[in-house]
């Protein structure tokens, strides 16, 4: 059968041993009592760690009680507590427990005390000069309007620059965007087209309202 | 509440150096410590902390260059291999702030601060 | 990483006068700011946390304001004992980067 010392009877370290009729506890210093649950320790032996504050316990009779701070617990405020288990930082934001406080640690593109605020959304962002915010894969961008560019739309952008006119066609600045006059023998948008010999072309059926060598808005 | 930095002096280039902060009236084990450095009559600069529970985070220059640890009552600042470009005075301070990182209720600063300890490097 | 600018780098005034020192954050610190004073040979001391709260003891003269990345510290009805270098600071905390508590430049205000 269970002998008398299994479960270890003795409370607060105390150690168990067997004796012929039952068990006997061994008890660490401070401690007494069949079990060792009565403390002789009091406030004046200091017991609460980490900035605890000791209440009662004035004589040997009576129990203290140690009040722990913030991020501490256990009878002596021994054992620190892992506030960051709560998960406070939201967006994947990692905690840091500085001791005295819990901070987040956000991620790029994420900013605040628990990382609440997206940064690459398109909430509150405004892209200039006609531009619309394009949200995708974690990050936002502006899609600028026609003779616009960089990253807010503010830049004066030349829609030639990037030479769109295909087939040595010539690029021209337009206020509502670009005409391509075509090199000999090619048509379309961009120039992009060959005319063939018999005067018909490998021109794919234009959109309706748009003739072939328009410009496109 | 109180902080006192110690171990100031002269010393050759190379030659490791440890300065030590002394704290009385709080626990270490509780609050974050900052050491911050200010080169003759320049600004203050930052150069790490160590948590309540002991991991030490650097400014991205200081890194490699300084090591911060702690005991139950000190903090401890090593200059690995001091240059001239060292030669300051060192301030050890306390973290103080909202516990909780809320948007009603968010701030940190240093307070106390110590009286500092200055550290000469030359040859 | 986060960068605090500080205006003017010096600022004077006559006694009863009042100044006022700008602090720019490189982006959004949602008001973690503090304000530091720091005479000759002396350690800083803590004048204003979270942007606008005055520490105690220090004289309601001392005031903090501003948000996102603009924030400014107004001393009014100068007094001599006010001649000292002030300093803004903040914290950034990133997961690319650790943590960071940079301070500005400072701001040296002269009492006439």
């Known amino acids: 059968g269970p002998g008398p010392c299994d479960g270890n009877p003795c409370a607060n370290g105390g150690s168990c041993s067997e004796t012929p009729r039952s068990f006997e506890c061994t008890c660490p210093r401070g401690f007494y009592g069949l079990r060792c649950e009565v403390s002789g320790v009091t406030c004046a032996d200091g017991p609460c760690f980490n900035g605890g504050l000791c209440v009662g316990g004035a004589d040997p009779d009576s129990a203290y009680i140690c009040h722990c701070p913030p991020g501490f617990q256990g009878s002596n405020c021994e054992k620190r507590v892992d506030r960051c288990s709560l998960q406070p930082c939201r967006n994947g934001g990692l905690c840091l427990d500085l001791g005295h406080a819990l901070r987040c640690r956000c991620r790029a593109g994420f900013a605040g005390p628990r990382c609440e605020h997206d940064l690459d959304d398109c909430a509150g962002r405004a892209c200039a000069n006609g531009g619309t915010c394009v949200e995708g894969g974690g990050a936002h961008r502006c899609s600028c309007a026609l003779g616009f560019g960089g990253r807010d739309c503010r830049e004066r952008a030349d829609p030639c620059a990037a030479r769109p006119c295909a087939h040595g066609g010539r690029c021209y600045a337009h206020f509502s965007g670009l005409v391509c006059a075509c090199a000999p023998g090619y048509m379309g948008a961009r120039c992009e087209f060959p005319v063939h010999p018999d005067g018909a072309s490998a021109l794919p059926a234009a959109p309706p309202g748009l003739r072939p060598g328009d410009p496109q808005r | 509440q109180s902080v006192e930095e110690s171990g100031g002096r002269l010393v050759t280039p190379g030659t490791p150096l440890t300065l030590t902060c002394t704290v009385s009236?709080?626990?270490?084990?509780?609050?974050?410590m900052s050491w911050v450095r200010q080169a003759p009559g320049k600004g203050l600069e930052w150069i790490g902390i160590?948590?309540?529970?002991?991991d030490p985070y650097y400014a991205s220059w200081a890194k490699g260059r300084f090591t911060i640890s702690k005991t139950s009552t000190t903090m401890d600042l090593k200059i690995t291999s001091p240059t001239t470009e060292d030669t300051a005075t060192y301030f050890c301070?306390?973290?103080?702030?909202?516990?909780?990182?809320?948007?009603?209720?968010?701030?940190?600063?240093?307070?106390?601060w110590g009286p500092g300890t200055l550290v000469t490097v030359s040859s | 990483a986060l960068v605090m600018t500080q205006t003017p780098s010096s600022v004077s005034a006559a006694v009863g006068g009042t100044v006022t020192i700008n602090c720019q954050a490189s982006?959004?610190?949602?008001?973690?700011l503090a304000w530091y004073q720091q005479k000759p040979g002396q350690r800083p001391k803590l004048l204003i946390y979270?942007?606008?709260n005055l520490e105690s003891g220090v004289p309601s003269r001392f005031k903090g304001s501003g948000s996102g990345t603009e924030y400014t510290l107004t001393i009014s009805d100068l007094e001599c004992d006010d001649a000292a270098i002030y300093y803004c600071?903040?914290?950034?905390?990133?997961?690319?980067?650790?943590?960071?508590?940079?301070f500005g430049g400072g701001t040296e205000v002269v009492v006439k």
């Open positions: 301070a306390r973290m103080i702030g909202s516990e909780y990182a809320s948007s009603s209720e968010y701030y940190d600063a240093f307070d106390p």
């Open positions: 009236g709080f626990s270490l084990s509780r609050y974050a």
């Open positions: 160590i948590t309540g529970g002991g």
């Open positions: 982006q959004n610190i949602y008001s973690n």
């Open positions: 979270g942007a606008s």
């Open positions: 600071q903040s914290a950034y905390y990133t997961t690319s980067v650790d943590v960071l508590y940079p």
